[in-house]
């Protein structure tokens, strides 16, 4: 089928990084500067994304792949492919529509992004509090209260785990 298609459609022979130029008898022309084609058989090249303002270039555009952006310091990516940059807050804060606000008592945020979340209620999972929570850290739950009866071995609190987070894709 691919061979048949290439006989019928000369454009299918144009590799990534080129386009099938109708103005030049359907020969494969390289993508012009600041444009790319990531697949073969394209009739046009796509304009490269430009990382301007609060965006900065993470990966330069090439003839076969678009540029990738991330955010300048003090901001983080939101959306697929870092379509937006959002202001960072401090740990122990969350970004509201009115700006960065401290987490209320009983909630925490150990990231520079995201929301203030309620401390885990250890008792609901049949456990006890080993380390109290703060604005920046969730509580650390330990064994159930019954396991801490006299004679039970002591438990060393684990280091606070880092909250979920990910870098821009």
């Amino acid at each position: 089928f691919e061979r048949t298609r290439s006989l019928q459609d000369p454009c299918s022979n144009c590799p990534a990084g080129t386009f099938c130029d109708n103005n030049r008898n359907q020969i494969c022309s390289p993508c012009p500067p600041n444009s790319f084609s990531s697949a073969g058989g394209q009739r046009t090249c796509d304009i490269c994304r430009q990382c301007k303002g609060v965006f900065r270039t993470r990966k330069e555009c090439s003839s076969t792949s678009n540029a990738e952006c991330d955010c300048t310091p003090g901001f983080h990516c939101l959306g697929a492919g870092c379509s937006m940059c959002e202001q960072d807050c401090k740990q122990g804060q969350e970004l509201t529509k009115k700006g960065c606000k401290d987490c209320c008592f009983g909630t925490f945020n150990d990231q520079k992004r995201g929301i203030c979340r309620p401390w885990t209620n250890c008792s609901l999972d049949g456990k006890s509090v080993l380390v109290n929570g703060t604005k920046e850290r969730d509580v650390v739950c330990g064994p159930s209260p019954a396991d801490l009866s006299p004679g039970a071995s002591s438990v060393t609190p684990p280091a606070p785990a880092r909250e979920p987070g990910h870098s821009p894709q």
Epitope: L78, G79, E86, E94, L95, T96, K97, K98, T107, R113, G114, I115, R117, P118, W119, T120, N121, L124, D125, D138, V139, C141, P160, A161, R162, E163, P164, G165, H166
Partner: antibody, heavy 120, light 106 residues
């Protein structure tokens, strides 16, 4: 590709417990909170709770506190939701859903759902 | 606890614009997300943070949020848009969903 795959349908007697699993693949599993949401037949969506796959911290909807337990197996990239003391009104499709990273807890990827039927 | 109110149903002719509302006390101060759910399928996020579209969601889907009402707008409605739509917010310590709106394409 990124996906959440849930365990199969269950039929339970009133008073019993059910444990539904949700296996994540194609992304950094510990990097995103996992939520559980249920939907009774012909009804809307009802949030049950979340787990932080990294540290294991949980938060449950008040309605389910004391009956639901959400756990995880980090090595298997799997979250579990156990609901106890089942009653007929717990008959529903149970979904796991990944929380994205926009402000305000959006659920950007969902499992296919697990039908739990509670019947005597 | 916080409540979100949606109309149970909205009907629209193909090619026209559908608007689905989500009411809540001072909802404009919150981030609103919208999900589409077709029969027998899991929900799909179509709008997040009031008005942003995940990749793969057509530009026909848009959102707004101010005062006490958030709105999901679907322009140039197609038969394939027929589904249930849910709004959702985060309030204090819980995820809250609206009751859902059934969109019928006439």
């Amino acid at each position: 590709q990124m996906q959440l795959v849930q365990s199969g349908a269950e039929v339970k007697k009133p008073g019993a417990s059910v444990k539904v699993s949700c296996k994540a693949s194609g992304y950094n599993w510990t990097g995103y909170y996992m939520h559980w949401v249920r939907q009774a037949p012909g009804q809307g969506l009802e949030w049950m709770g979340w787990i932080n796959p990294m540290a294991g911290g949980t938060n449950y909807a008040q309605k389910f506190q004391g009956r639901v337990t959400i756990t995880r197996d980090t090595s298997a990239s799997t979250a579990y939701m156990e609901l106890s003391s089942l009653r007929s009104e717990d008959t529903a499709v149970y979904y796991c859903a990944r929380e994205g990273w926009a402000r305000g807890v959006e659920l950007d990827m969902w499992g296919q759902g697990t039908l739990v039927t509670v019947s005597s | 606890s916080y409540e979100l109110t949606q109309p149970p149903s909205v009907s629209v002719a193909p090619g026209k614009t559908a608007r689905i509302t989500c009411g809540g006390n001072n909802i404009g101060s919150k981030s609103v997300h919208w999900y589409q759910q077709k029969p027998g399928q899991a929900p799909v996020l179509v709008i997040y943070y009031d008005s942003d579209r995940p990749s793969g969601i057509p530009e026909r889907f848009s959102g707004s949020n101010s005062g006490n009402t958030a709105t999901l707008t679907i322009s140039r409605v197609e038969a394939g848009d027929e589904a249930d739509y849910y709004c959702q917010v985060w309030d204090s310590s819980s995820v809250v969903f609206g009751g859902g709106t059934q969109l019928t394409v006439l």
